[in-house]
Interface confidence: low
C-alpha cells in the first residue's frame, strides 16, 4: 500500500540556473542505494519521466524529447533529469517523487545575446540583451577583455566599441544567491592601429602597412588611400581597391604616384620612391561587405632632403611633423651641430666632411640622411 | 613554378589514424595556402580543409571537423593531414593543392598534388 | 552549403567536335567558379578561372562562361589529348564543393 506524502515529507526547493541551449541535471537522491520508482513531474504535475520496470519512461510533457536520466546511476540511488537545448519556458518547479518523498527544484533558465551582430566596427555600440523568465529579477555584470565593468538588469549597453574590447566578454547573471556564467565572443573591426608615420630619405622606397586587428573567415569589401600631399591644396583618391576572400584586387590607381598593393593581407601599398611633392596625410578606408560605416587608417609620410649648393648646406624636411621635433646638422666625428626645431635647417660655409642630418624626437632619431662636402679650392686669378 | 609531392598509398585498418604528407617546391610553405580535398572510388571530389599561414587559420568542412587536423612543417616545407578515427567510407585518394600562382587568389586551387590513395580495410 | 550540380557524367565525343559541360549553382555564387581538368594518374589542371577567364597556357579551344547560378565549360575543336575528367569548383564561400565531374572520352 502506497502512502501518502505529507507536507514534512516535502524537502526543501533548491534553485538552479540554466543557460539557453545549455544542457542541465537536476538531482534527486534516494535514501537508499538502490533502484526505485521514481517521476519527475512539473508544476502542473504533468509527468516528465520515470521508471516502470527497469525502463526509463516519458510522460506526455513538451520535454518528452529532450529530458533524459542517467540510468547507470540509479542503483545507487540517484534519479537525476537531464534537460538538454534549454528553453526559457522550461523554467519551472520540478517535483522528483522517490520513496515517498518529494523533492521540488525551481530551474530558471536564462540567455545573453547580442541585439545586432557580433562584429562590430570601431565607435559601435553594442547592447547585450538577457533574456528571463517571468518573475525572475536577475542582475547583469559583464567583463570586458580589456578589464572594463559593466552592471544592468535585462539590458547592458557600451555606447562605443574600442579596439581593446575585442575579445571574450564574460558576463554573470545573478539570481537568488546563484550565478550563471555566459562568455560572448566580440569582435572590433579596427585596423590595428589608428595612425601611423612613416619616414623616409628623398628617392627611398616607402613601404605603407595596414594591419587589421582581426581575423574573419571571409572578408569582402573595397577600400580607398585619400592622399593630402603638404603641398598640394586638395587631397586626391591614390587607389582604390577590392578584397575578396582576403584577397586584394586594385580598381584604379593614380598615375603620379604609381603606387603598387599586395595582392594578399596584410594591406600593403608601395610607394616606388620618397619624394617631397608626396609628402603628406592619408586616410585609408575600408568598408566591409554586410557592414555599416568603415574602418579607418591614418598614414602620414615625412620626407627628408639634404643638398649642397654652393656655400650653402641644407637640410629640409616635408610632411606633417610635431613642433617638438628637432632637425639636426652635424659634421660626424665633430661637435659642430646646428639644430632646429623648424622644417629647415642650414649650415653657409660647411667644413668638409661627411655631414648628417637627423630628424630626432626627444633624442630619439627618426629619420637620418648623410652628404659628404667636399672641400672647394678657391680658383686662381689669371694674370 | 609550385609543384606538390604527395606521400605514397597506405593501407589503414578501421578505427586506425592517417597521415599524408605534400611536400612542396619552387616556393616556400609559409606563402601559400593549402587546401585538402579527397574522392572516394565512385564518388566526387570533397573539400576537406583548407590551412591559411597568413594568419594561421584552419578552416574545416563540418563534415570532417573533429577527425581531420592540418599541420605544417615549415622547416621542410611539407604540409600534412591527419585523419583519425578511420571508416572504411574514408577510402579515398587524398589530395593537397594549394594557391601557388602570384597572380590568381589566394585561395585559389591552382596547383595540384598527384594524390595519395588510402584504403581502410580490416 | 552551395551543391554543385554538373552534368553530364560522362560524355563521348569525336575529334573535332564541339561539348558543352554544364554546372549549376544551388544559390548564388557570382562569377565565383574555376573548372579543372585531371587525367589518370596525374595532376589536376587548373584550366578556367572566375568562370570565363582562361588560364595563361591553357589552349583557347577552352571557354567558360555563365554567372550567379549556371556555368558552362566549351571544349571547341575537340583534340584527342582533351579525354579526361573534368571538374567545377565554387570558391564563393566556405566549405568549398565540387561539382560531380564529367568523363570525356574521345572516339
Known amino acids: 500500500e502506497q502512502k501518502l506524502i505529507s507536507e514534512e515529507d516535502l524537502a526543501a526547493k533548491k534553485v538552479v540556473l540554466g543557460k539557453k541551449g545549455d544542457t542541465v541535471e537536476l538531482t534527486c537522491n534516494a535514501s537508499q542505494k538502490k533502484n526505485t520508482q521514481f517521476h519527475w513531474k512539473n508544476s502542473n504535475q504533468i509527468k516528465i519521466l520515470g521508471i516502470q520496470g527497469l525502463f526509463l519512461t516519458k510522460g506526455p510533457s513538451k520535454l518528452s524529447d529532450r529530458a533524459d536520466s542517467r540510468k547507470s546511476l540509479w542503483d545507487q540511488g540517484c534519479f537525476s533529469m537531464i534537460i538538454k537545448n534549454l528553453k526559457i519556458e522550461d523554467s519551472d518547479t520540478y517535483i522528483c517523487e522517490v520513496e515517498n518523498k518529494k523533492e521540488e527544484v525551481e530551474l530558471l533558465v536564462f540567455g545573453l545575446t547580442a541585439n545586432s551582430d557580433t562584429h562590430l566596427l570601431e565607435g559601435q555600440s553594442l547592447t547585450l540583451t538577457l533574456e528571463s523568465p517571468p518573475g525572475s529579477s536577475p542582475s547583469v555584470k559583464c567583463r570586458s577583455p580589456g578589464g572594463k565593468n559593466i552592471q544592468g538588469g535585462r539590458t547592458i549597453s557600451v555606447p562605443q566599441l574600442e579596439r581593446q574590447d575585442s575579445g571574450t566578454w564574460t558576463c554573470t547573471v545573478s539570481q537568488d544567491q546563484k550565478t550563471v556564467e555566459f562568455k560572448i565572443d566580440i569582435v572590433v573591426l579596427a585596423f590595428q592601429k589608428a595612425s601611423s608615420t612613416v619616414y623616409k630619405k628623398e628617392g627611398e622606397q616607402v613601404e605603407f602597412s595596414f594591419p587589421l586587428a582581426f581575423t574573419l573567415e571571409k572578408l569582402t569589401g573595397s577600400g580607398e588611400l585619400w592622399w593630402q600631399a603638404e603641398r598640394a591644396s586638395s587631397s586626391k583618391s591614390w587607389i582604390t581597391f577590392d578584397l575578396k576572400n582576403k584577397e586584394v584586387s586594385v580598381k584604379r590607381v593614380t598615375q603620379d604616384p604609381k603606387l603598387q598593393m599586395g595582392k594578399k593581407l596584410p594591406l600593403h601599398l608601395t610607394l616606388p620612391q620618397a619624394l617631397p611633392q608626396y609628402a603628406g596625410s592619408g586616410n585609408l578606408t575600408l568598408a566591409l561587405e554586410a557592414k555599416t560605416g568603415k574602418l579607418h587608417q591614418e598614414v602620414n609620410l615625412v620626407v627628408m632632403r639634404a643638398t649642397q649648393f654652393q656655400e650653402n648646406l641644407t637640410c629640409e624636411v616635408w610632411g606633417p611633423t610635431s613642433p617638438k621635433l628637432t632637425l639636426s646638422l652635424k659634421l660626424e666625428n665633430k661637435g659642430a651641430t646646428v639644430s632646429k626645431q623648424a622644417k629647415a635647417v642650414w649650415v653657409l660655409n660647411p667644413e668638409a666632411g661627411m655631414w648628417q642630418c637627423l630628424l630626432s624626437d626627444s633624442g630619439q632619431v627618426l629619420l637620418e640622411s648623410n652628404i659628404k662636402v667636399v672641400p672647394t679650392w678657391p680658383t686662381p686669378v689669371q694674370p | 613554378q609550385v609543384q606538390l609531392v604527395q606521400s605514397g598509398a597506405e593501407v589503414k585498418k578501421p578505427g586506425a589514424s592517417v597521415k599524408v604528407s605534400c611536400k612542396v617546391s619552387?616556393?616556400?610553405?609559409?606563402?601559400?595556402?593549402m587546401h585538402w580535398v579527397r574522392q572516394a572510388p565512385g564518388k566526387g571530389l570533397e573539400w576537406m580543409g583548407i590551412f591559411d599561414p597568413r594568419d594561421g587559420q584552419i578552416i574545416y568542412a563540418e563534415k570532417f571537423q573533429g577527425r581531420v587536423t592540418v599541420t605544417e612543417d615549415t622547416s621542410t616545407d611539407t604540409a600534412y593531414m591527419e585523419l583519425s578515427s578511420l571508416r572504411f567510407d574514408d577510402t579515398a585518394v587524398y589530395y593537397c593543392?594549394?594557391?601557388?600562382?602570384?597572380?590568381?587568389?589566394?585561395?585559389?586551387?591552382?596547383?595540384w598534388g598527384k594524390g595519395t590513395t588510402v584504403t581502410v580495410s580490416s | 552549403e552551395t551543391t554543385l550540380t554538373q552534368s553530364p557524367a560522362f560524355m563521348s565525343a569525336t575529334p573535332g567536335d564541339k561539348v558543352n559541360i554544364s554546372c549549376k549553382a544551388s544559390q548564388d555564387i557570382d562569377d565565383d567558379v574555376n573548372w579543372y581538368q585531371q587525367k589518370p594518374g596525374e595532376a589536376a589542371i587548373f584550366i578556367i578561372q572566375e568562370a570565363t577567364t582562361l588560364v595563361p597556357g591553357i589552349p583557347p579551344r577552352f571557354s567558360g562562361s555563365g554567372y550567379g547560378t549556371d556555368f558552362t565549360l566549351t571544349i571547341n575543336n575537340i583534340e584527342s589529348e582533351d579525354a579526361a575528367y573534368y571538374f567545377c569548383l565554387q570558391h564563393d564561400h566556405f566549405p568549398y564543393t565540387f561539382g560531380q565531374g564529367t568523363k570525356l572520352e574521345i572516339k
Open positions: 593543392a594549394t594557391g601557388g600562382n602570384e597572380d590568381y587568389y589566394f585561395y585559389y586551387m591552382d596547383v
Open positions: 619552387g616556393h616556400t610553405l609559409t606563402e601559400l595556402s
